[in-house]
Amino acid sequence: MSVTACQGLGFVVSLIGFAGIIAATCMDQWSTQDLYNNPVTAVFNYQGLWRSCVRESSGFTECRGYFTLLGLPAMLQAVRALMIVGIVLGVIGILVSIFALKCIRIGSMDDSAKAKMTLTSGILFIISGICAIIGVSVFANMLVTNFWMSTANMYSGMGGMGGMVQTVQTRYTFGAALFVGWVAGGLTLIGGVMMCIACRGLTPDDSNFKAVSYHASGQNVAYRPGGFKASTGFGSNTRNKKIYDGGARTEDDEQSHPTKYDYV
């Protein structure tokens, strides 16, 4: 796979993953009422990071936001923070990667700069994906813990004994947002890894197609094959160099190197 394709695919995969992270963060169905072996409620409860909702049997849905910060569980706050950090890093990663894309030419930006930006965006995407995966996993763990606690104590009170009143323990299970979050985090992570792999192909490397200097009779100048191809953007950076002893030889060019992918 060429650098351009690897980089482009990494960018697209990360973009899809990032969109999924945003979607998961905004979704209301992080936890949904467990309907198995439960009292059959005429309302269906589900909860998100920002609000809790109820769908009545008529289909009418009503949501209430969590209008407090201090009253919320620390774990929920942590999950919110992780998802927001993931989104912020993803936004930065996308902005950086747009400029890093090999297929987009911006001014006289050389490959080493693009390589650095590609690596930066890749790392940002990896961290973004990890944040999302951790956030979703923390929430899932919280759900599992609460699920078994409420299963062990299905009804609080003694239900009529000693005048105590039964209260319905609504158990919650994994909502769609968790699966969206896991997949999205994974895609962002994979996309980031692909960007990092693409970066290696962009980085100037001694082993990659060294420039070959030809001794032109009467002129001690070296020409690099393909050095003036407009599509690669190397033209403006190609400099003539003196040849100190005759014959064809290779030399390192500090400005930019054609890579093995440039002629694909």
Partner: antibody, heavy 119, light 113 residues
Framework: EVQLVESGGGLVQPGGSLRLSCAVS????????MHWVRQAPGKGLEWVAY????????YYADSVKGRFTVSRDNAKNSLYLQMNSLRAEDTAVYYC????????????WGQGTLVTVSS | DIVMTQSPDSLAVSLGERVTMNCKSS????????????LTWYQQKPGQPPKLLIY???TRESGVPDRFSGSGSGTDFTLTISSVQAEDVAVYYC?????????FGQGTKLEIK
Amino acid sequence: EVQLVESGGGLVQPGGSLRLSCAVSGFTFSSFGMHWVRQAPGKGLEWVAYISSGTTNIYYADSVKGRFTVSRDNAKNSLYLQMNSLRAEDTAVYYCVRSGYYGNSLDYWGQGTLVTVSS
Amino acid sequence: DIVMTQSPDSLAVSLGERVTMNCKSSQSLFSSGNQRNYLTWYQQKPGQPPKLLIYWASTRESGVPDRFSGSGSGTDFTLTISSVQAEDVAVYYCQNVYIYPLTFGQGTKLEIK
């Protein structure tokens, strides 16, 4: 105007069967869940059954479970209650009721049809 | 099943008087998801089918006079008629609309002295 008209009531022997119908008009029948509620003579109200708009959710009172079957035909704007293995305690006025959009309320009631189970 | 218990069974009041009737459920009817109580009140006048008065424990159905009001949360609910009129003579039922089966209270009969 919302209208719910029950029919099919009458006298039936214990162990017998009866099918109640409810003809609906004045609203989009296919968008609303429907209930059957009964009231024994001189007694209070007893919820019998519920069927959701798309028939995906059907619930029954314990006292009629396994004997009564609720169904609907959205094309005909009709609700049905098939009653089998009838008992004397099933004697009541049966109301066809629309499930309200808000609060799971029972917002529109028919006039009812009397079912008498007696030998 | 949720048991709904209404009190008193009957009451006789004078016209214009304020009246309250209670309804107690054996389980909480409060939904944390939308902070609402799933209790409904109905009025049944003699020879007529019941009529919806109040849903969500305190929201009046459209067309219901504002002298009717509902309150309460969790397991204890109250229906109040601020100034009883002659046409309010009826049996009032509360209903659990939170958990199936949707049980009714036994009713409170309101009469005029």
